[in-house]
């Protein structure tokens, strides 16, 4: 008897969606896997015969409950399927956000790019699918713990009127109100601000 | 049922030009999003173009860039792609497609109604 896959699961992140699993233990030599998705009530092969323990599912339509299955074969033998359901459009973790930031005297002139989809056009990004796509952005002074929440409204924000010679971080993420669904933080970029750009009288 | 119909397809000299209509019965220009695709003899669909109707945004393949231009007139009910610069390689049949959700723009899965193609061929 063959044994399943094991801890399978669907790794998806802006619609890259991977199904992943674990080869079991197997006494009798290495296992191949087969992964299928259930199309229009037949099950279609997507990868068939892989040693791979991972099988790409990006082109899966992004809206509905999509039922995917991986088994175990080995020579003439095979496990039993191993279903999972997912919908790419709930499931899908909105990964981070792009970041330009400039520093402009005392403020940071900051503009967010969505992020890229696979299997989609450059300029078709998670903005366009999501309808209700915000950014949140949470801003600190280097070295203090407090931070400040804003969301901007549009792809880009200035922070006004910052301490001068002063050292701030940014990271920005997507946001989806109408879900409350929020997505993965980008990496905090630091920049210092310059002089104040009042004029003393 | 809403249906696509394309038209304007043909035999069309290197560098020539052609526009492509798609038109709609019903209120189909409504949907999120309508796409070009194209099949070249012998591969598979790939896709073109598409129009978003929520911000008129248009995207677009890279081998078609600069080159080919997608619009709508909804007072039309249809959607046009104007091909200039043709090469040989953009001999295909091409066909639009609408989807109801609007959630993708170049993969065929995401659509739900397509039109019967029209032939473009590029020789000289």
């Known amino acids: 008897m063959v044994p399943p896959p094991e801890n399978v699961r669907m790794n998806s992140v802006n619609f890259k969606n991977i199904l992943q699993w674990e080869s079991p233990a197997f006494a009798k030599g290495n296992l191949t896997f087969t992964a299928q998705y259930l199309s229009y009530r037949i099950f279609q092969d997507k990868c068939m015969n892989t040693t791979l323990t991972e099988c790409d599912f990006s082109s899966l339509s992004k809206y509905g409950d999509h039922t995917l299955r991986v088994r175990a074969e080995f020579a003439d033998e095979h496990s039993d399927w191993v279903n999972i359901t997912f919908c790419p459009v709930d499931d899908t973790i909105i990964g981070p956000p792009g970041m330009q930031v400039e520093v402009l005297a005392d403020s940071l002139h900051m503009r967010f790019l969505a992020p890229k989809i696979e299997n989609e056009y450059e300029t078709w990004t998670m903005k366009n699918v999501y309808n209700s796509w915000t950014y949140n952005v949470q801003y600190w002074k280097n070295g203090t713990d407090e931070k400040f929440q804003i969301t901007p409204q549009y792809d880009f924000e200035v922070l006004r009127n910052l301490e001068p010679w002063t050292t701030y971080c940014v990271q920005v993420r997507g946001f989806l109100p109408d879900r409350n669904k929020a997505g993965e933080w980008s990496e905090p970029v630091c920049e210092q601000t310059t002089h104040d750009e009042t004029v003393p009288s | 049922e809403v249906q696509l119909v394309e038209s304007g397809g043909g035999l069309v000299q290197p560098g020539g030009s052609l526009r492509l209509s798609c038109a709609a019965s019903?209120?189909?220009?409504?949907?999120?999003?309508i796409g070009w695709f194209r099949q070249a003899p012998g591969k598979g669909l790939e896709g073109v173009s598409c129009?978003?109707?929520?911000?008129?945004?248009?995207h677009y393949a890279d081998s078609v860039k600069g080159r080919f231009t997608i619009s709508r007139d909804n007072s039309k009910n249809t959607v046009y792609l104007q091909m200039n610069s043709l090469r040989a390689e953009d001999t295909a049949v091409y066909y639009c497609?609408?989807?109801?959700?609007?959630?993708?723009?170049?993969?065929?899965?995401?659509?739900?109604?397509w039109g019967q193609g029209t032939q473009v061929t590029v020789s000289s």
């Open positions: 129009i978003s109707a929520s911000d008129g945004s248009t």
């Open positions: 497609a609408a989807s109801l959700l609007g959630l993708g723009c170049k993969s065929e899965a995401d659509y739900d109604y």
């Open positions: 019903g209120n189909s220009l409504d949907y999120p999003t």
